[in-house]
Interface confidence: medium
């Protein structure tokens, strides 16, 4: 499984990711159990975060991992939990935030110099899939899809942002994780009020690039809380 690969330090030796832009299905998006995706303004945020159930890390966002919410808890009840920052304890790579990996039980910085920042996502615009596109094999050995192309380029399937080339991050698209461009100044970003609220979202945006942060656009300050437009702006 992917988890077993993430558990090892072989993460840096991944074969070229699968290629692919994921699609964005239908207007009405819902998550069982009974969660309806918010409609209306496409820059809405979700105020009331509901824990997102999961079975594998790949079903969570790129800044989350799948685990039992309580230490030693029932393994059958797992949710997406916020990733662990540098120097925090870990058991596998997926537990560490983008740009870090698990080494000797501690999250440490990846060798590659990748952009920092939270993964930005959009609620109603598109789909992201856990794109495991691995027909039951370890990612180290066999990738079953026919969509091989150069490692890390835009559209390639990825596990973490460190799998993508510079200027790209790994974000969900129609239930697949693919390399997408890091956001530039002026581009729309998504700022979640609650960590992990992306559990209800299909498509993710990348985070803002170096020297930029996701802030409310100045002329949108008067807008209602739910429709404030955020863009990448200089610090």
């Amino acid at each position: 499984t992917l988890n077993s690969v993430l558990n090892s330090n072989a993460i840096k030796n991944l074969p070229p990711p699968l290629g692919g832009a994921a699609g964005h299905p239908g207007s009405a998006v819902s998550a069982a159990p009974g969660i309806l995706y918010p409609g209306g303004n496409k820059y809405q945020t979700i105020d009331n975060y509901q824990p997102y159930p999961c079975a594998e890390d790949e079903e969570c966002g790129t800044d989350e991992y799948c685990a039992s919410p309580t230490r030693g808890g029932d393994a059958g009840v797992q949710i997406c939990l916020a990733c662990r920052k540098r120097r925090k304890r870990c058991m596998r790579h997926a537990m560490c935030c983008p740009g870090n990996y698990c080494k000797n039980g501690i999250c440490v910085s990846s060798d590659q110099n990748h952009f920092r920042g939270e993964i930005e996502e959009t609620i109603t615009e598109s789909f992201g899939n856990d794109h495991s596109t691995l027909d039951g094999y370890s990612r180290r050995t066999t990738l079953s899809s026919k969509m091989y192309h150069t490692k890390g380029q835009e559209g390639s399937v990825c596990l973490r942002s460190s799998d993508c080339a510079s200027g790209l991050c790994c974000a969900r698209h129609f239930w697949s994780k693919i390399c997408k461009p890091v956001l530039k100044e002026g581009q729309v970003c998504t700022k979640h009020r609650r960590k992990g609220s992306h559990g209800l979202e299909i498509f993710q945006r990348c985070y803002c690039g170096e020297g930029l942060s996701c802030r409310i656009q100045k002329d949108h300050h008067q807008a209602s809380n739910s429709s404030r437009l955020h863009t990448c702006q200089r610090h």
Epitope: P25, P53, M147
Partner: antibody
Framework: EVQLLESGGGLVQPGGSLRLSCAAS????????MMWVRQAPGKGLEWVGA????????AYADSVKGRFTISRDNSKNTLYLQMNSLRAEDTAVYYC?????????WGQGTLVTVSS | DIQMTQSPSSLSASVGDRVTITCRAS??????FNWYQQKPGKAPKLLIY???FLYSGVPSRFSGSGSGTDFTLTISSLQPEDFATYYC?????????FGQGTKVEIK
């Protein structure tokens, strides 16, 4: 070899119901999102909806929202499309397809005719 | 919904001809864009994904280009088996939408 085989199509009266099935083989079904796409006679392709790998999430086109339900049984490698309150404009060949970075494998399609 | 406008709706060409089909989206779809080929009575087949990447097994005479709103499918030298209907599709926004199709016929 990857194969998708739809079944369950046929003639149904307006307002009626039908359940389509799509039997998958040759790949690890539970690793892929799946979609339904339809094509009215002599017309183009229309996306119907999609379902996430574990069936936790679904999405639908406005034209079928509230009437159609997509589900999957990963233990049986089968995708379903439950169609209720059928209308004449739902007449089409219905295809199930596997999603990767595009719809890379399609079934042969099953014809649904809604007519009185 | 994003509207996909394909042109031309049909064209006649000869074997060996260079054929270009264009597709315009009503708003930007980045590069999350696919091309499909469909022959009468058959299911569509994926040709190009992510705007320009050739799907495995597809002959190299097919190529895709474009980003944003304008995309192109080119067949460098038309072969007898290429006479079919071609559809573009965006996968950047919900719902996934297709162009109306371009039928490539024998001149």
């Amino acid at each position: 070899e990857v194969q998708l085989l739809e079944s369950g199509g046929g003639l149904v009266q307006p307002g009626g119901s039908l359940r389509l099935s799509c039997a998958a083989s040759g790949f690890t079904f539970n690793k892929y999102p799946m979609m339904w796409v339809r094509q009215a006679p002599g017309k183009g392709l229309e996306w119907v909806g999609a379902i996430q790998q574990r069936g936790l999430k679904t999405a639908y086109a406005d034209s079928v929202k509230g009437r159609f339900t997509i589900s999957r049984d990963n233990s049986k490698n089968t995708l379903y499309l439950q169609m209720n309150s059928l209308r004449a404009e739902d007449t089409a060949v219905y295809y199930c397809a596997r999603w990767t970075s595009g719809l890379d494998y399609w079934g042969q399609g099953t014809l649904v005719t809604v007519s009185s | 919904d994003i509207q996909m406008t394909q042109s031309p709706s049909s064209l006649s060409a000869s074997v060996g001809d260079r054929v270009t089909i264009t597709c315009r989206a009503s708003q930007s779809v980045d590069r999350y864009f696919n091309w499909y080929q469909q022959k009468p009575g058959k299911a569509p087949k994926l040709l190009i994904y992510s705007a320009s990447f050739l799907y495995s097994g597809v002959p190299s005479r097919f190529s895709g280009s474009g980003s944003g709103t304008d995309f192109t499918l080119t067949i460098s030298s038309l072969q007898p088996e290429d006479f079919a209907t071609y559809y573009c599709s965006q996968s950047t926004h919900v719902p996934l939408t297709f162009g109306q199709g371009t039928k490539v016929e024998i001149k």
